[in-house]
């Protein structure tokens, strides 16, 4: 039985089996067609989801989509219902937590109050001034707390205490990649990571240790990546993962937060990375303890100079390491988090490539999460 | 474009009364709060009060309580300043200015000012 | 109620100077501080808010910076057309208060 599942599928109707290496090839093996079923699956960019969530206190901006302007949410008249369909439009099915938070004195746009028309957030024609003064800070997952703090230091062996939200990607029982959980249901991680496999079948995700291949494996039901764009072949490096049942979360089982659409981190901004991957760059092995390092931004004009990058890294892109080098991400950490603390962490980047591993000059580049917001919400709601 | 459009010149008696006018127009008249603000002559600029267009409500400066009433009519995109027992002091270029959707926004846009006179 | 002292009361410069004009707050305003700018005969127009945004269609010759009681207007290279009176707003607590401004004159 082993053997059979290992090297083979079974196709129903009329019950036969096909070789395992022709799932996901493409073509209909099965008169069925359920070979090419249960495989990474790419979804569109999709259309602008009409609300967002600004780094000042986790605001609530909702879009004038006549006009294409961007009114922030007065608290006047918001309710719980309005919460929920405001996080239910960004794709969580969790019960948000809202409150009034002072206009501050540098608020640029427009204040309105929000009523909703057809489970969707809209501007109140009628409504008058801001009367509380406030803006509605909305938070739709409680996330990014962790019950130990890292120190600052260069690497050193990390605990799952630390980063509750880092997870083993395997295939067949092997660790490809990291990934982090953004929601009971999601694990977020990089599209290069299924190359090679495209069947989601066996593909495992393990939660909850700092140890490889000591915690239970969970299955997964879906993959999906964005359609792949020739022009920028190493763009739109990001995966999401669903879950086939959703995660329990615990002490070492929590989401780290997406980080907010205004999330711009400037040069030298100090951020985390971790993982299980090559401690040596080509050689070496996986490591079997979780490791972490402290990295920082490095300015993009500077990683596409003529000694690094040459151009290739995009906007949608980001580089992160030390000016000098030696601490960088490598194999075996791909799609694991680039984590940046502020009241929360938030995963602002996904490892995703560089040449070698630690060069001063070609620092790690990490697929810029926040240029992919409108996608993942797009995703989620399409699962909802 | 945004525009704060004031009415002319007045020269009123000490003790009479003088009421300023200023159309908005250009945007939500409804959705922004409007102060007035006035200037004596060789002066600098003093806060009167300020008014929310939308609900008719009002909030003014301690000195000028119980002498200044701010009303609109929304059908013209109007706010009115009206101050009585008028006394030499209150000779001053009156402007109407525009806020943003909340009382501690700064003064966006501007009307061209009204000057009143009081000379006996 | 909140005082605002402008320094100095009035300068003279020349096209081309750097300018700075100075407000403080009798009590702590955060960054809740704007300045306008008002030539004779003219309504004052908004330079800056929050004590260092510049408010659109300002040149950029124009900044703002402070905190707390101090604050600072900055013009890096004065031109003709800058030479005007200029105030602070604290838009801190009500009642708001201006400070009493600051005459830019031709050299």
């Known amino acids: 039985k082993v053997i059979l599942d290992k090297y083979y599928f079974l196709c129903g109707q009329p019950l036969h089996f096909i070789p395992r290496k022709q799932l996901c090839d493409g073509e209909l093996d099965c008169p069925l067609g359920e070979d090419e079923e249960h495989c990474v699956k790419s979804f569109p960019e999709g259309p602008a989801v009409a609300v967002r969530l600004s780094k000042d206190r986790s605001t609530l901006q909702v879009l004038d989509s006549a006009t294409g302007n961007w009114f922030s949410a007065c608290f006047d008249n918001f309710t719980e219902a309005l919460a929920e369909t405001a996080c239910r439009q960004m794709g969580y099915s969790s019960k948000p937590t809202f409150r009034a938070v002072e206009i501050g004195p540098d608020q640029d746009l427009d204040v309105v109050e929000i009523t909703e028309n057809s489970q969707e957030l809209r501007m109140r024609n009628s409504s008058g001034p801001c009367l509380s003064g406030s803006l509605v800070s909305l938070h739709c997952l409680a996330c990014g707390k962790s019950l130990k703090t890292p120190r600052v230091v260069g690497v050193e062996e990390a605990s799952v205490d630390s980063w509750p939200w880092q997870v083993s990607i395997q295939y067949d029982k092997q660790h490809v990649c990291g990934g982090s959980i953004l929601d009971p249901h999601w694990v977020l991680t990089a599209a290069h990571c299924f190359r090679k496999h495209t069947d989601v079948f066996n593909w495992k995700v393990r939660a909850g240790s700092d140890k490889l291949g000591s915690f239970p494996s969970l299955a997964v039901a879906k993959i999906i990546i964005i359609e792949f764009n020739p022009m920028y072949p190493k763009d739109n490096d990001i995966a999401l993962m669903k879950l086939q049942f959703p995660l329990t979360f615990s002490g070492t089982v929590r989401p780290i937060c997406l980080p907010f659409f205004d999330e711009e981190l400037t040069p030298a901004t100090p951020l985390w990375i971790i993982g299980w991957g090559f401690t040596k760059q080509n050689g070496g092995k996986m490591s079997d303890i979780l490791l972490q390092a402290s990295v920082q931004v490095i300015d993009s004009t500077r990683c596409n100079a003529d000694d690094a990058y040459q151009g290739e890294v995009t906007e949608k892109m980001m580089c992160a390491g030390i000016p000098e080098g030696g601490v960088d991400t490598c194999q075996g950490d791909s799609g694991g988090p680039l984590m940046y603390q502020s009241d929360q962490w938030h995963v602002v980047g996904i490892v995703s490539w560089g040449y070698g591993c630690g060069g001063p000059s070609t620092p790690g580049v990490y697929t810029k999460v926040s240029a992919y917001l409108n996608w993942i919400y797009n995703v989620w709601k399409a699962e909802l | 474009q945004v525009q704060l459009v004031q009415s002319g010149a007045e020269v009123k008696k000490p003790g009479a009364s003088v009421k300023v006018s200023c159309k908005a127009s250009?945007?939500?008249?409804?959705?922004?709060?409007m102060h007035w603000v006035r200037q004596a002559p060789g002066q600098g600029l003093e806060w009167m009060g300020w008014?929310?267009?939308?609900?008719?409500?009002?909030g003014y400066a301690q000195k000028f309580q119980g002498r200044v009433t701010m009303t609109r009519d929304t059908s013209t995109s109007t706010v009115y300043m009206e101050l009585s027992s008028l006394r030499s002091e209150d000779t001053a270029v009156y402007y109407c200015?525009?806020?943003?959707?909340?009382?501690?926004?700064?003064?966006?846009?501007w009307g061209q000012g009204t000057l009143v006179t009081v000379s006996s | 109620d909140i005082q605002m002292t402008q320094s100095p009361s009035s300068l003279s410069a020349s096209v081309g100077d750097r300018v700075t004009i100075t407000c403080r707050a009798s009590?702590?305003?955060?960054?809740?501080l704007a300045w306008y700018q008002q030539k004779p005969g003219k309504a004052p127009k908004l330079l800056i808010y929050?004590?260092?945004s510049l408010q659109s269609g300002v040149p950029s010759r124009f900044s703002g910076s402070g905190s707390g009681t101090d604050f600072t207007l900055t013009i890096s290279s004065l031109q003709p057309e800058d030479f005007a009176t200029y105030y602070c707003?604290?838009?801190?607590?009500?009642?708001?208060?201006f400070g009493q401004g600051t005459k830019v004159e031709i050299k």
């Open positions: 009590q702590s305003i955060s960054t809740w």
């Open positions: 008014m929310n267009p939308n609900s008719g409500d009002t």
């Open positions: 707003q604290q838009l801190s607590s009500y009642p708001l208060t």
């Open positions: 929050a004590a260092s």
């Open positions: 200015a525009k806020g943003r959707e909340w009382l501690r926004s700064p003064f966006d846009y």
């Open positions: 250009g945007y939500t008249f409804s959705r922004y709060y």
